[in-house]
Interface confidence: medium
């Protein structure tokens, strides 16, 4: 007769492992019992269970409640058992010993491999600011058995580096994604992709990039100088900038307080009907947690009665 088993049985943590053992006997041969034992190198054999055609399954105390026979129908020559709820400590060598009568005993070994799927975690790096050099955007760590694969999926240009730490029964892999922050990266997804034989599909964790920046400020509204004349209604100056976090705006007048009737509405400065007292140097101050910018313009309100020309200076400062 001959004994059939598998060289390796692979199971995911928490699943049931079927340990196969089938005796293909000659006619007239009987299987007296099937003994299962764990036989890791350097350690003595540890009995799991005995299977008997008449007396059924006898499980050793160390495996009580964890070893069962496969559900019926069962072939009398099938000595396979189920190891319930496999844990990492179950990984190792197992021996099936079939005692036939009168031919004697046959044994075969198999290796049980318990896959431990990773539970990945993504940790964002320090706050990203435009103007920084190469900076850590995020790190992704996954621990499993065998070692998982950790990669990145993103449109953002950057560099990756990985390191691995081996533990007694698993390995932790950490991958870091570095980039040179720029405002174009704002809102872009950075996805950590973890692959592992114990996963039905890759696990993905997405981090949205936030890059702090503040654009140069400029003031609109003085493009047509001739519109800024006494009596004109609805005149306004608008401060243009953008940033992350979104900036706040503040208007001041360099050569004195804001004239009465002038309304500040965020980035917009609204004027009542223009008079010569509205002439002056106006400053838009833009700021966020990252930086601040100033832009100033000179308003010269024309008197239509005068023929003299009007000059407008635009100055931008940061």
């Amino acid at each position: 007769g001959e004994l059939e088993t598998s060289d390796v049985v692979t199971v995911v943590l928490g699943q049931d492992a079927k340990l196969p053992c089938f005796y293909r006997g000659d006619s007239g041969e009987q299987v007296g019992q099937v003994a299962w034992a764990r036989v890791d190198a350097g350690e003595g054999a540890q009995e799991l269970a005995l299977l008997h055609s008449k007396y059924g399954l006898h499980v050793s105390p160390a495996y009580e409640g964890r070893v069962e026979q496969p559900p019926p129908p069962r072939n009398p020559l099938d000595g396979s058992v189920l190891l319930r709820n496999a844990v990492q400590a179950d990984e190792g060598e197992y021996e099936c010993r079939v005692s036939t009568f009168p031919a004697g005993s046959f044994q075969a070994r198999l290796r049980l491999r318990v896959l431990v799927p990773p539970l990945p975690s993504l940790n964002p790096g320090p706050a990203l600011e435009e103007g920084q050099g190469l900076t850590l955007a995020a790190s992704c760590t996954a621990e499993g058995s065998p070692a998982p694969s950790v990669t990145w999926d993103t449109e953002v240009k950057g560099t990756t580096s990985s390191r691995s730490f081996k533990h007694s029964r698993s390995a932790a892999v950490t991958s870091e994604f570095h980039l040179v922050p720029s405002r174009s990266m704002n809102g872009q997804p950075l996805t950590c992709v973890v692959s592992h034989p114990g996963l039905l599909q890759d696990q993905r964790i997405t981090h949205i990039l936030h890059v702090s920046f503040l654009a140069e400020a400029s003031v609109r509204g003085l493009e047509d100088q001739n519109l800024w004349h006494i009596g004109r209604e609805g005149a306004m100056l608008k401060c243009l900038s953008e940033g992350q976090p979104p900036p706040s705006y503040n208007w001041t007048r360099l050569d004195g307080p804001l004239p009465s009737g002038v309304r500040v509405d965020g980035d917009t400065l609204g004027f009542p009907p223009l008079t010569t007292e509205h002439s002056g140097i106006y400053v838009c101050h833009v700021s966020n947690e990252f930086s601040s910018r100033d832009s100033q313009v000179t308003v010269d309100v024309l008197d239509p009665q005068e023929d003299s020309g009007k000059q407008v200076d635009l100055v931008s400062a940061s």
Epitope: Q30, V31, G32, S53, K54, Y55, S99, F101, P102, G104
Partner: nanobody, 115 residues
Framework: EVQLLESGGGLVQPGGSLRLSCAAS????????MGWYRQAPGKEREFVSA????????YYADSVKGRFTISRDNSKNTLYLQMNSLKPEDTAVYYC????????WGQGTQVTVSS
């Protein structure tokens, strides 16, 4: 060749004790469940007790539970049955058997319980 040789039988008074032995040869004793059976005159052979190859998990017929103890010594290839509180109805020929689907039997040893 498989051989099973029972010994230890005899005449005993009710309430007495006997210890049966079964010396096994011709096969790897430690690889098999072993059992004791008995057959009273004019009756069918009946199961008494069995034990796994490692010596754990003993099985007993209800009629002998608490009175009989099965054991084995794999280093000596020997099976034992300690019988206490014997009753007249325990009178029978006791057989040692290799517990495979079609049991292999010894020749038996006579146990008589009588006053």
């Amino acid at each position: 060749e498989v051989q099973l040789l029972e010994s230890g039988g005899g005449l005993v008074q009710p309430g007495g004790s006997l210890r049966l032995s079964c010396a096994a040869s011709g096969f790897t004793f430690s690889d098999y469940y072993m059992g004791w059976y008995r057959q009273a005159p004019g009756k069918e052979r009946e199961f008494v007790s069995a034990i796994s190859s490692t010596g754990g998990s003993p099985y007993y017929a209800d009629s002998v539970k608490g009175r009989f103890t099965i054991s084995r010594d794999n280093s000596k290839n020997t099976l034992y049955l300690q019988m206490n509180s014997l009753k007249p109805e325990d009178t029978a020929v006791y057989y040692c058997a290799v517990e495979v689907p079609y049991d292999y039997w010894g020749q038996g040893t006579q146990v008589t319980v009588s006053s």
